[in-house]
Interface confidence: medium
Amino acid sequence: GWVWNQFFVPEEMNTTSHHVGRLRSDLDNGNNSFQYKLLGAGAGSTFIIDERTGDIYAIEKLDREERSLYILRAQVIDITTGRAVEPESEFVIKVSDINDNEPKFLDEPYEAIVPEMSPEGTLVIQVTASDADDPSSGNNARLLYSLLQGQPYFSVEPTTGVIRISSKMDRELQDEYWVIIQAKDMIGQPGALSGTTSVLIKLSDVNDNKPIFKESLYRLTVSESAPTGTSIGTIMAYDNDIGENAEMDYSIEEDDSQTFDIITNHETQEGIVILKKKVNFEHQNHYGIRAKVKNHHVDEQLMKYHTEASTTFIKIQVEDVDEPGGGGS
């Protein structure tokens, strides 16, 4: 019968001829009367056989990731009779893996959105790298993930590639972060190969800022001839949030005279001071009112950011229409 061990050949061998192994018939007494032949895909081009001894050699550099096994057939013939000594037999040459492939991230580009001020441990995104080396062969395809850029705000779970928040972030200070993740094979041991990917993490807005008046004091003038309903000026607050979270409502906080009102222009986000009652210069030539501003929408859990609404003082001078020369402060 045929005698052989399992055949393995390492990939990427640089030698011109690499001994793979030997196959022989147990009838071969070594007197060179037997002739060994190799048949099948790769025979003669990738592998050759020493016809007298049955030694098999790889004469080409192999790439396991291209082809990991070869199925060949062996024949042995008695030269004196020209007959087959053994029935033709099939055998396998396996290409063994070396760590010649770095991890690659497949789903690039990575982008994620997470609310600002999210607590530590919040899951952002999972990145996954793939290694073309043999997962069953040692640690060649066993990956470890690490963070090259993104501390102290982010962390990555070493074995899963799950990115989590490790420190609260304020969108109003920075609204985008680039995180660089490295995947290393050989579980990070010496000789490991690595690949990197970039992840763009965008912070979405939460309503963590209250509107604040641009000025602590506004000065407006109203003519004593102005009819009720007259717009006498505008006031404005700013809110570092965006979108719906920056929408605001203005109102009167203090006006003992009940002479003025404030309405909100939702398009411009300005407060418009309106004359509610006609004024008389001789009766009163200046007024002081206090206005406040609040966000239009505030979620219950964010109310802590919205205590004590911002206020402003508005000095309103009445103009005497009978005496144009006599204005006011």
Partner: antibody, heavy 119, light 107 residues
């Protein structure tokens, strides 16, 4: 610190003119309304005139209307009171005063300058 | 115009005593727009109280103001030697007018 220093007072004949100045320092002059207040010898305080922070509005006491003009030069941080057609009853110490930012009281005053109207 | 009448004209007290000064307006002073000033001899007036009851910067807490509408009061809880001076009330609800003053003198 806030300082207001008046000058330009003196003796003038009835019908004459005088221009008082008030040099301001230690605060943003252009942000505050400014006033003149006077005090006749041995008497109480009498408000005279006010000018708005940007200089566009003035307002006067009835007793001086048409005779006195208040003005300001922001580049010089100086307040002025031009007094024409002076009368004996205008004799007083004239103070410049800064109006408080958030209401209309006077939080800083100068030391005053004396104007005497006599023949 | 709003006329302010202060009483008494003169108040004779000793250091450590309590002084109560009154200021009455001829018509209601809106938004408690009333101030109190102190004037020592040969000096400019100094703001003590604004908005009827708010102490100005640097004013000791022995000075307090109260009142609304037409009746206002300045109280000095315990007179110090430097408190003997003339005190003026001022309304700024409509234009600016001063009371005629109350002199607090050493008894």
């Amino acid at each position: 610190q806030v300082q207001l220093v008046e000058s330009g007072g003196g003796v003038v004949q009835p019908g004459g003119s005088l221009r008082l100045s008030c040099a301001a320092s230690g605060f943003t002059f252009s942000s505050y309304d400014m006033h003149w207040v006077r005090q006749a010898p041995g008497k109480g305080l009498e408000w005279v005139a006010v000018i708005s922070y940007e200089g566009t509005n003035e307002y006067y006491a009835e007793s001086v209307k048409g005779r006195f003009t208040i003005s300001r030069d922001t580049s010089k941080n100086t307040l002025y009171l031009q007094m024409n057609s002076l009368r004996a009853e205008d004799t007083a110490v004239y103070y410049c005063a800064r109006e408080r930012y958030f209401d209309w009281s006077f939080d800083y005053w100068g030391q005053g300058t004396l104007v005497s109207v006599s023949s | 115009e709003i006329v302010l009448t202060q009483s008494p004209g003169t108040l004779s007290l000793s250091p450590g005593e309590r002084a109560t000064l009154s200021c009455r307006a001829s018509q209601s002073v809106s938004n408690t727009y009333l101030a109190w000033y102190q004037q020592r001899p040969g000096q400019a007036p100094r703001l003590l109280i604004y908005g009827a009851s708010s102490r100005a910067t640097g004013i000791p807490d022995r000075f307090s103001g109260s009142g609304s509408g037409t009746d206002f009061t300045l109280t000095i809880s315990s007179l110090e030697p430097e408190d003997f001076a003339v005190y003026y009330c001022q309304q700024y609800s409509n234009s600016w007018t001063f009371g005629q003053g109350t002199k607090v003198e050493i008894k």
